[in-house]
């Protein structure tokens, strides 16, 4: 039965304007069942770090160890798969870093990064200095294990030099990699020493070896590709948002709710209210009022702005997000102070979030 009584009757999901909220591609860590996994929170100057999994707070237990900026999962199981986030709370702000964990029989880790192609990788040699092939940018080759979601584009690079200029060819699982080996083929950009595969599928999984050679020698480097398939997921809300806020009577304030959802989300801002002097209905459920929801006539539903607040505006504000899969909600409290008792910061306004494509 419902956990609240709505003061205003609203349908769960009215028609939405054509916006797309989407998870920006997080790094993917892949572990085999039974393995241990350690991830370092890639945020700087973190005073306090909190962790979430699929939007739910993550605490230490007999298999999960949280030490400083490190998360350790011992004896991983498929249930450990999901979207993780670490939030670094600082004195003035907070920042969140997202990553995927995929516990699967495939061995792989990391994610492909979209390097900016640059001809700086194409090194010309003095024609007199004969030289066997050598790597010119090993930093771009450090990540050997790449795990990417299906339908993404993958780029492997082997920037090299030599004299005469070496040639590059690619092997898949130790055999010549031919265009007909995959639907849609692949691209080789010799100028950038790269192999590009668009819209990867599970059959693209395997070892990819670049062989760079000239008449004075041959070098090679192998990457492992894992293609991670996906399941529909309910909305995920950024940890720590909306954030508690305080302002004086007559002040303005904004609450921000950052939503991650592949599917169209419906956002509602809800507040506990009183009706006929009571906070609860005859059924014992609290009265709630929908202040704002995403829809045709609603701009930037991720932000709730309150202007010229009164003491009656104080209380809990809930950001409730639903899609066709399920729901998620997080709340924050507004404290309204008398005008003479100004807080440290009169207005606590969080910057409007980016829309992630």
């Amino acid at each position: 039965r419902p956990s609240f009584s709505l003061v205003e009757d609203t349908t769960l999901e009215p028609e939405e304007p054509p916006t797309k909220y989407q998870i920006s591609q997080p790094e993917v860590y892949v572990a085999a069942p039974g393995e241990s996994l350690e991830v370092r929170c890639l945020l700087k100057d973190a005073a306090v770090i909190s962790w979430t999994k699929d939007g739910v707070h993550l605490g230490p237990n007999n298999r999960t160890v949280l030490i400083g900026e490190y998360l350790q999962i011992k004896g991983a199981t498929p249930r450990d798969s999901g979207l993780y986030a670490c939030t670094a709370s600082r004195t003035v702000d907070s920042e969140t870093w997202y990553f995927m964990v995929n516990v699967t029989d495939a061995i792989s880790s990391g994610d492909d990064e979209d390097d900016t192609d640059g001809a700086e990788d194409f090194v010309s040699e003095n024609s007199n200095n004969k030289r066997a092939p050598y790597w010119t940018n090993t930093e771009k080759m450090e990540k050997r294990l790449h795990a990417v979601p299906a339908a993404n584009t993958v780029k492997f690079r082997c920037p090299a030099g030599g004299n005469p200029m070496p040639t590059m060819r690619w092997l898949k699982n130790g055999k010549e990699f031919k265009q007909e080996h995959r639907i849609g083929g692949y691209k080789v950009r010799n100028q950038h020493w790269s192999l590009i595969m668009e819209s990867v599928v599970p059959s693209d999984k395997g070892n990819y070896t670049c062989v760079v050679e000239n008449e004075y020698g041959s070098i090679n480097h192998t990457y492992h590709l894992d293609v991670v398939e996906r399941s529909p997921h309910r909305p995920i809300l950024q940890a720590g948002l909306p954030a508690n806020a305080s302002t004086v009577v007559g002040g303005d304030v904004e609450f921000v709710c950052k939503v991650y959802s592949d599917a169209q989300p419906h956002i509602q801002w809800i507040k506990h209210v009183e009706k006929n002097g009571s906070k609860y209905g005859p059924d014992g459920l609290p009265y709630l009022k929908v202040l704002k929801h995403s829809g045709i006539n609603s701009s930037n539903a991720e932000v709730l702005a309150l202007f010229n607040v009164t003491e009656a505006d104080a209380g809990e504000y809930i950001c409730k997000v639903s899609n066709y899969i399920g729901q998620a909600n997080q709340s924050a409290w507004l404290t309204v102070l008398p005008k003479q008792q100004a807080p440290g910061r009169e207005k606590e306004i969080t910057a409007s979030p980016d829309y992630l494509e």
Partner: antibody
Framework: QAQLVQSGAEVKKPGASVKVSCKAS????????MHWVRQAPGQGLEWIGL????????SYNQKFRGRATLTVDTSTSTAYMELSSLRSEDTAVYYC???????WGQGTLVTVSS | DIQMTQSPSSLSASVGDRVTITCKAS??????VAWYQQKPGKSPKLLMF???YRYTGVPSRFSGSGSGTDFTLTISSLQPEDFATYYC?????????FGQGTKLEIK
Amino acid sequence: QAQLVQSGAEVKKPGASVKVSCKASGSTFTSYNMHWVRQAPGQGLEWIGLIYPGNGDTSYNQKFRGRATLTVDTSTSTAYMELSSLRSEDTAVYYCARGGFDYWGQGTLVTVSS
Amino acid sequence: DIQMTQSPSSLSASVGDRVTITCKASQGVTTNVAWYQQKPGKSPKLLMFSASYRYTGVPSRFSGSGSGTDFTLTISSLQPEDFATYYCQQHYSTPYTFGQGTKLEIK
């Protein structure tokens, strides 16, 4: 691995009501919407509505609003779909499906005949 | 309500063929489209969601594309087990509507 098991076939008279159950196992029942979809013999799929077991929120296809009632019993991880004022054109297989339509029940045939 | 119009309504093809089924929404649904496969007497099975995401365990010969109002499901090389009825569905706004189905038969 989630699994949805539905109640057995029903034969009803016009004007009567039917209540179909859908028992979930293997996943967090309260974390996903439960959809109800029907399919008349030889026809396509038609969405009836959804319920979110976490708080009881419902959304109905306007076509079924007032006749269909979706409820859940979280203690048994069971969802229910009740359809009242049955008519012959309600004869169909009724399916429950988890949030992302990634898991479906086996279907329940409801026959409305005088 | 958003109407989903599928074409063709039926299709005959042979094993090994490349097959494309299209679905047109009556208004823009961004990429909020799913595809299902259904065999006689069985429940539908999810193939694709969010237009182009292949659901876990679905063979790579299935692919989906499109955004806005026009969507396609492609089977790159038909296998015997692929002969079934296919439905598109929009999961953009309620009521979540389905296409009328495409029956894929052996030629």
